[in-house]
């Protein structure tokens, strides 16, 4: 099929980047500028994305491939390719309707993007609190109460960062 | 006028440092591709690199490592700081703005040169 | 890297003449070449683009032309203005996210 398709189409021999100019007694013609074709025998060229806005330019539009945009700083990538901008919260937030909001008591966010999420209930693995979980951090599990021998020396969670959390027991 | 002029040019010694400024008029340099070229005496020419308006900066891959480019926003003009010179670094430097948001050179300065010798 | 083949290296013409000169790359480049038009002691100054888009300002008696690997300048009829140096020079992405700008040898346009 394709070396039918190649005897009887003058357009499957125009290779990426070119488009098939049927104004030009269909030869093999540039995609012009802001405009690319990232696959040969095309009949037309595609119209390159422009990063406007919050969006900036991380590669620039060829005549075979897209532009790729990112977010300015403050703001991430979401969705495919990069299709929308959200805004960045501080660790210990996330992104509501009316803004960035600090993460409800027993929860954290330790990243700049995504929703706060419950500290890790250290009771469902037999074990104990070792450090107790901010807005920011996780709790950390230590070992069982069983696993501390008589007279062994417990250890002495440091001051919380912000408020002094406890794992839901 | 939409231009540009490079300065910071000179002789200096191999394995020494310099910084070439590129400042900019009649545009902003921050929405364009920025782009350093340099071309050896009788020799062709050679790109350097770009910081695109995104800020992203690329290099070709005899430039990476020693070479960094950067921009002042606030004083609209690019710089190249070398690093680790060697004699056959010794070329004029130009700047240029890219084209249609690309980065071909479209409009150029009128070069700077720099010599490694000792 | 992608390598540019340029030739010829020189050619000697007359004022009326047609003159070519061809870029061949390594590798298939889309349409992703400019030309460049370089006078002695001066700066270079862009020709096209995009293999065939004429920039701002450039006399159409210039034009581009190609895609893929081989790619040609063309000066309808050579002016005496236009004896002077010209350079190809390819963009190339590569996966790595490296960028290749490639420039040609170069083609000295010498009066016959």
């Known amino acids: 099929f394709e070396r039918t398709r190649s005897l009887q189409d003058p357009c499957s021999n125009c290779p990426a980047g070119t488009f098939c100019d049927n104004n030009r007694n269909q030869i093999c013609s540039p995609c012009p500028p802001n405009s690319f074709s990232s696959a040969g025998g095309q009949r037309t060229c595609d119209i390159c994305r422009q990063c406007k806005g919050v969006f900036r330019t991380r590669k620039e539009c060829s005549s075979t491939s897209n532009a790729e945009c990112d977010c300015t700083p403050g703001f991430h990538c979401l969705g495919a390719g990069c299709s929308m901008c959200e805004q960045d919260c501080k660790q210990g937030q996330e992104l509501t309707k009316k803004g960035c909001k600090d993460c409800c008591f027993g929860t954290f966010n330790d990243q700049k993007r995504g929703i706060c999420r419950p500290w890790t209930n250290c009771s469902l693995d037999g074990k104990s609190v070792l450090v107790n979980g901010t807005k920011e951090r996780d709790v950390v599990c230590g070992p069982s109460p069983a696993d501390l021998s008589p007279g062994a020396s417990s250890v002495t969670p440091p001051a919380p960062a912000r408020e002094p959390g406890h794992s839901p027991q | 006028e939409v231009q540009l002029v490079e300065s910071g040019g000179g002789l200096v010694q191999p394995g020494g440092s310099l910084r070439l400024s590129c400042a900019a008029s009649g545009f902003t340099i921050s929405s364009h591709h920025m782009i350093w070229v340099r071309q050896a005496p009788g020799k062709g020419l050679q790109y350097i690199g770009f910081i695109n308006d995104g800020d992203y900066t690329y290099y070709t891959n005899s430039a990476k490592g020693r070479f960094t480019i950067s921009r002042d926003n606030s004083k609209n003009t690019l710089y190249l700081q070398m690093n680790s010179l060697r004699a056959e670094d010794t070329a004029v430097y130009y700047c240029a703005r890219g084209v249609d948001g690309t980065s071909y050179p479209g409009l150029w300065g009128q070069g700077t040169l720099v010599t490694v010798s000792s | 890297d992608v390598v540019m083949t340029q030739s010829p290296s020189s050619v000697s013409a007359s004022v009326g003449d047609r003159v070519t000169i061809t870029c061949q790359a390594s590798q298939s480049i889309g349409a992703d070449l400019a030309w460049y038009q370089q006078k002695p002691g001066k700066a270079p100054k862009l020709l096209i683009y995009?293999?065939?888009t004429l920039a701002s300002g450039v006399p159409s008696r210039f034009s581009g032309s190609g895609s893929g690997t081989d790619f040609t300048l063309t000066i309808s009829s050579l002016q005496p203005e236009d004896f002077a140096t010209y350079y190809c020079?390819?963009?190339?992405?590569?996966?790595?996210?490296?960028?290749?700008?490639?420039f040609g040898g170069g083609t000295k346009v010498e009066i016959k």
């Open positions: 995009r293999a065939s």
């Open positions: 020079q390819a963009i190339y992405y590569g996966t790595d996210d490296v960028i290749y700008h490639t």
